[in-house]
Each structure stands twice: as C-alpha cells, then as structure tokens.
C-alpha cells in the first residue's frame, strides 16, 4: 500500500525566513511528485514531476522530503498540497501542508463618526491590512475594553451594540446618550506586538425635531 | 551505510551554555532535516527542534524555545544544538536524528551533566 | 499537543514468552505510530513504523497492529537479547514519545 504524509500539517513561519515543507511517501517504486498551492481563488503549481516550475525556481528547491523556500513572504500563506503517483502507474496519493506566514499587525485603521443621532444605528469599524494570521479586534471606549456582549460588565450595560472581534465593526442599535465617549481599537494576531489605533470621540446627539 | 556521530560528554555548570555538534555521512545532508532529542534520567524522549540543513530553517518545541539554537555547517555535514541558561534539570542524554517522517537514524547520543 | 499513554510501565517474561506493549494516542492518529528499542548506554533503534512496517533487518517475532487510537506491539517468542526498553512514538501531527515499557527476564 501506499502513504503520503507530513508530520506537520501546519507550519507557522515570521516573514523573511527559509522554511521547509515535508512531504514524506513510501510504497512507490518510481514517485512523480508534485506541489500545488492553494490560497482563495488562486491555484499555482509549485512543483511538477519533480521538478520546480519556473515561476517558483529562484526560490524553492524540490527535496526528496519535501519543498524548501529559502524566503517566504505574505504571499505564500495557503495550502499546499504534496501528491505523488507512480510514474505510469495508478497508485496515488496526497497530503495538504498549511503554511501561516507570521506578519505581525499594523497600525488600525478606524472608521468612527464624530457625531451620531440618538436612537438610530451607529456602526464604527476598524481594520488593518498586513497582520498574518488575520488580526482579531478590540474595542475601547474611554480606555476601558469592550466585552462582546454590552450585558456581561455593568459599565456598558446601557449600551446596546453589537461587535465583531473578526470584522472589527461595532454597531450600535440603537445609540444611546450613554454611547459618548472617546473610542479606539487593537489589532492582535498572537504574532509581534499588538497595535492601537488613534482614539477618536463620538458624540450621541438628540435627534434634531422641526418645528 | 549511514552514520551519525555526536561529540563528547560534557559537564557544565549552571548558568552556562553547551554547545554539541553531530556530523553525519552515508547520505545527503541537505535532503533531510534534522532532530535534536532529549532523554533526561529517568525520564521519557522530547523533541527538541530541528533543522532543515538546506536552507537553515528551524523549528523549536515550545518547552525549549529562547534557549536553545538549532545550526547546520552544509561544508561539514555538521548539525549543531546549543543550549543555554542551563540548570540541574537539562542532565540528560541528547540525541540528534534524522527525520523522514519518523525518526530513522540516530547518533550515539551526548551525555550532558549541569552541576555546580 | 497528541499524548501517548504506553503500559505497562514494565513487565518481566520468560524465554519463549509473547510479550505485549500498548500505546493509546489522545485522539487518532491514522496508523502513523513507529516502535524503538532503546537498549542501556545506547540511542533508540527503529523497529515498525507506519503501525506494521518491520525496517529492514529487524526480526520477524516484532509485531505491530492497531488503528484510530489504539496501537499494540508484540514479541511473539522473548528473546535474551530483546532485554531493553521499548518506545512508541506518534507522528501524525508533530512528534510524541510514549513514555516506555522496560523489558526484563524471568
């Protein structure tokens, strides 16, 4: 029978550093190795009948044991898959490798209205493009942590919101006269050091009535 | 035939640092990484890290991470570990293999004594 | 992290005997277990991996079998010289020894 596997199905690397992806195989007299990656819509093949293709070959070398990078950047998190069939045979087999590619958060952007009406909705955002893995966010009003759900901490329980530590988006519905303050939010990705985005203050205003 | 060959007994103080290399031949260096395994007395084996002596790349066990550096000299075929801030608890018998999935091929191991 | 329980801790059998050594993973690990003999003074020595696959040169009385968590490795007849200590070891997700079953003679 035949085996295709890796001891590390998942690999975690900073930015700029040599890693190597193991592909390790048994059962084939004459093995074909290739590699494909794997990121969204994007598919590539890195390695074909074992050997790098072009577009890769400045900076990847094939190993009986797997793929070397000599550098990785951003670019490269995704999957890869490592598959091996007989030359001219029909024995096969496959093992996916993820590789994370550690950059740590930059600074946030946020996106908070300076004035908001009472009783309608209010949604703040905050994001950041470079953390690998994808940031997760905090949010902060008046320098105290936001909890996730407004009716866990009695500061906040007036407040009616909804926030996303994923998308970073903090929606108030509706806005209360107790919602005022100054807010801001941190980027982390458990990799390098949090980021702080500027502290912006956001008035709840009465809604203005005609007469 | 493959053979992996590690330096001598060492006995160091607390505090210090030890530095053991590992030299192999039979095979090709580069096309394996390479393991550095703990045996302290009375105890189990541990992964320590490894090395993939292609392109210098590492990878440390988290119990181990910050003291210990994993290198590779590809002219001499040579895996080094160095280990610092040692204390009492770092005697044991270090091994350093070679990975193709599992670990194949082991040197002799290196006695390493921490004691004041 | 996969933990590996091993037992028993130790045993003591007779020449001839079938002796028999178990590993129990934390969650399955798809038959990638491998088998050492380490004997005193010495470095560990592969006997199976991928669960049944005796390396090269390695007695056919070492046996291995199991799948998912559960892994077993036999000495159908004890021999003098199979007096040492005996280690599983997981490599399915990283690497994990069990703690070992030392060998002795009745």
């Known amino acids: 029978s035949v085996t295709v596997h890796s001891s590390e199905p998942e690999v975690r690397i900073p930015e700029n550093n040599p890693v190597k992806l193991s592909c390790a195989y048994s059962g084939f007299s004459s093995p074909r190795v290739e590699w494909k990656f794997d990121q969204g819509d994007t598919t590539r093949l890195v390695c074909y009948n074992n050997k790098i293709t072009a577009s890769y070959e400045d900076r990847v070398t094939f190993l009986p044991t797997g793929i070397t990078f000599k550098s990785v950047t951003r670019e490269d998190t995704g999957t890869y898959t490592c598959m091996v069939s007989e030359e001219g045979g029909n024995s096969y087999g496959e093992v996916k490798v993820k590789l994370i590619v550690l950059v740590p958060p930059s600074k946030p952007t946020v996106n908070i209205p300076s004035s908001a009406t009472i009783g309608n909705r209010a949604v703040l955002t905050c994001s950041e493009q470079d953390g690998s893995p994808p940031s997760e966010y905090t949010w902060f009003k008046d320098g105290i942590v936001m909890p996730t759900n407004p009716k866990s901490t009695r500061a906040f329980s007036n407040s009616s919101y909804v926030l996303n530590p994923t998308t970073g988006e903090l929606v108030f519905d509706p806005l209360s006269a107790s919602d005022t303050g100054e807010y801001s939010c941190e980027a982390r990705n458990g990799y390098g050091t949090p980021m702080t985005s500027n502290a912006v203050r956001m008035e709840a205003v009465e809604r203005n009535v005609g007469v | 035939e493959i053979q992996l060959v590690q330096s001598g007994a060492e006995v160091k103080k607390p505090g210090a640092t030890v530095k053991i290399s590992c030299k192999v031949s039979g095979y090709s260096f580069t096309d394996y990484s390479m393991y550095w395994v703990q045996q302290a007395p009375g105890k189990g084996l541990e992964w320590i890290g490894y090395?993939?002596?292609?392109?210098?790349?590492?990878r440390y066990n988290q119990k181990f991470k910050g003291r210990v550096t994993i290198t590779a000299d590809k002219s001499t075929d040579t895996a080094y570990m160095e280990l610092s801030s040692l204390r009492s608890e770092d005697t044991a018998v270090y091994y350093c293999?070679?990975?193709?999935?599992?670990?194949?091929?082991w040197g002799q191991g290196t006695l390493v004594t921490v004691s004041s | 992290d996969i933990q590996m329980t091993q037992s028993p801790s130790s045993l003591s059998a007779s020449v001839g005997d079938r002796v028999t050594i178990t590993c129990k993973a934390s969650?399955?690990?798809?038959?990638?277990i491998a088998w050492y003999q380490q004997k005193p003074g010495k470095a560990p020595k592969l006997l199976i991996h991928y669960t049944s696959t005796l390396q090269a040169g390695v007695p056919s009385r070492f046996s291995g079998s199991g799948s998912g968590r559960d892994y077993t490795f036999t000495i159908s007849s004890l021999q003098p010289e199979d007096i040492a200590t005996y280690y599983c070891?997981?490599?399915?997700?990283?690497?994990?020894f069990g703690q070992g079953t030392k060998v002795e003679i009745k």
């Open positions: 969650q399955d690990i798809n038959n990638y």
């Open positions: 090395i993939d002596p292609y392109n210098g790349g590492t």
């Open positions: 293999a070679r990975q193709t999935d599992y670990f194949d091929y």
């Open positions: 070891l997981q490599y399915d997700n990283l690497w994990t």
